[in-house]
């Protein structure tokens, strides 16, 4: 019954682009400007979500699918499709009601975005520190002291502290 | 005995989507991230994005953000990817891995996991 | 993001020999520089981390060095069982990345 009332349909020879209109028997139209179908068989068309404020556009609206947001310079996304955009803040911080704050002493943040997350523990794993950490950095898990040779120091320092480039998320 | 074990291999027709999963054990699943690299046939390897099981922290590869999606379990200890809108490119090999101890390099590969596209 | 060039797609050499393999990014990594082995079946194996610290189980004849943009891997003593792919990969920047690889093959 479902197979025969969808060759019947009329509407269901609409293409993905165009809205069966029933102001004019049932005839495939082009969705209006700045509306889109992603789908065949559709009675209206939908929107186009507009990037506006801290929202940039990522890719136009076409009649066949909707616009993508992304955020503009020293903000990134949150959420399904970019829903929300939030602050950025430095490496080696994170981002609180107060603004961006400085990773506390054993916890870092090596991007522009997200929360201070402890230092690797190298113990939990039978190992030891190689590197230490920094506001900006996880430590770098090494040997276990048991396999370094007698005197070898089982720790160096961090690098310099440098803001690498960082991929927006 | 620490590993990671991936699902079997999946043939997909172009648009649809398959879900991969790497179930880890043999270590504290919530404390190391698990990454995702991609080996297209005769290629070289390419960082998908990662998770974080503890509270499902991610990040992606930009250039993957649209069409992987990355989720972990952790009752069962188990790591996913899911592939959407699937395209011939999308052929290939697919490895999760674990880190060595913090999330600059990957100690632990899983065997990998062949996903075919083809109409 | 950071592209990691290994100028050698692949390389013949015999057993006993020497190998050396470089990797240059294309910017300072600060020595967060690994390299990774896959032998012909897909099999993948962490050699060395950190530029130059070899992984526990892996044999003392590899070798790794450098530092900045520039950084090399070093079989000091072929054996059979090397004859795989070698790659690359920087952990310092998010979207981590690998090199081409180099294919190690037995005169």
């Known amino acids: 019954f479902e197979r025969t009332r969808s060759l019947q349909d009329p509407c269901s020879n609409c293409p993905a682009g165009t809205f069966c209109d029933n102001n004019r028997n049932q005839i495939c139209s082009p969705c209006p400007p700045n509306s889109f179908s992603s789908a065949g068989g559709q009675r209206t068309c939908d929107i186009c979500r507009q990037c506006k404020g801290v929202f940039r556009t990522r890719k136009e609206c076409s009649s066949t699918s909707n616009a993508e947001c992304d955020c503009t310079p020293g903000f990134h996304c949150l959420g399904a499709g970019c829903s929300m955009c939030e602050q950025d803040c430095k490496q080696g911080q994170e981002l609180t009601k107060k603004g961006c704050k400085d990773c506390c002493f054993g916890t870092f943040n090596d991007q522009k975005r997200g929360i201070c997350r402890p230092w690797t523990n190298c113990s939990l794993d039978g190992k030891s520190v190689l590197v230490n950490g920094t506001k900006e950095r996880d430590v770098v898990c090494g040997p276990s002291p048991a396999d370094l040779s007698p005197g070898a120091s089982s720790v160096t320092p961090p690098a310099p502290a440098r803001e690498p480039g960082h991929s927006p998320q | 005995q620490v590993q990671l074990v991936q699902s079997g291999a999946e043939v997909k027709k172009p648009g649809a989507s398959v879900k991969v999963s790497c179930k880890a054990s043999?270590?504290?699943?919530?404390?190391?991230?698990i990454n995702w690299v991609k080996q297209a046939p005769g290629q070289g390897l390419e960082w998908i994005g990662n998770?974080?099981?503890?509270?499902?922290?991610?990040n992606y590869n930009q250039k993957f953000k649209d069409k992987a999606t990355i989720t972990a379990d952790k009752s069962t200890s188990t790591a996913y990817m899911e592939l959407s809108s699937l395209r011939s490119e999308d052929t290939a090999v697919y490895y999760c891995?674990?880190?060595?101890?913090?999330?600059?390099?990957?100690?632990?590969w899983g065997q990998g996991t062949t996903v075919t596209v083809s109409s | 993001d950071i592209q990691m060039t290994q100028t050698t797609s692949s390389l013949s050499a015999s057993l006993g020999d020497r190998v050396t393999i470089s990797c240059r990014p294309s910017?300072?990594?600060?020595?967060?520089l690994n390299w990774y082995q896959q032998k012909p079946d897909g099999t993948v194996k962490l050699l060395i981390y950190?530029?130059?610290r070899l992984r526990s189980g892996v044999p003392s004849r590899f070798s790794g060095s450098g530092s900045g943009t520039d950084y090399s891997l070093t079989i000091s003593n072929l054996e059979q069982e090397d004859i795989a792919t070698y790659f690359c990969?920087?952990?310092?920047?998010?979207?981590?990345?690998f090199g081409g690889g180099t294919k190690l093959e037995i005169k």
């Open positions: 891995t674990r880190d060595y101890g913090s999330a600059y390099s990957y100690s632990l």
């Open positions: 043999g270590y504290t699943f919530t404390s190391y991230w």
């Open positions: 998770i974080y099981p503890s509270d499902s922290y991610t």
């Open positions: 910017q300072d990594i600060s020595n967060y």
């Open positions: 950190y530029t130059s």
């Open positions: 990969q920087q952990g310092d920047t998010l979207p981590y990345t």
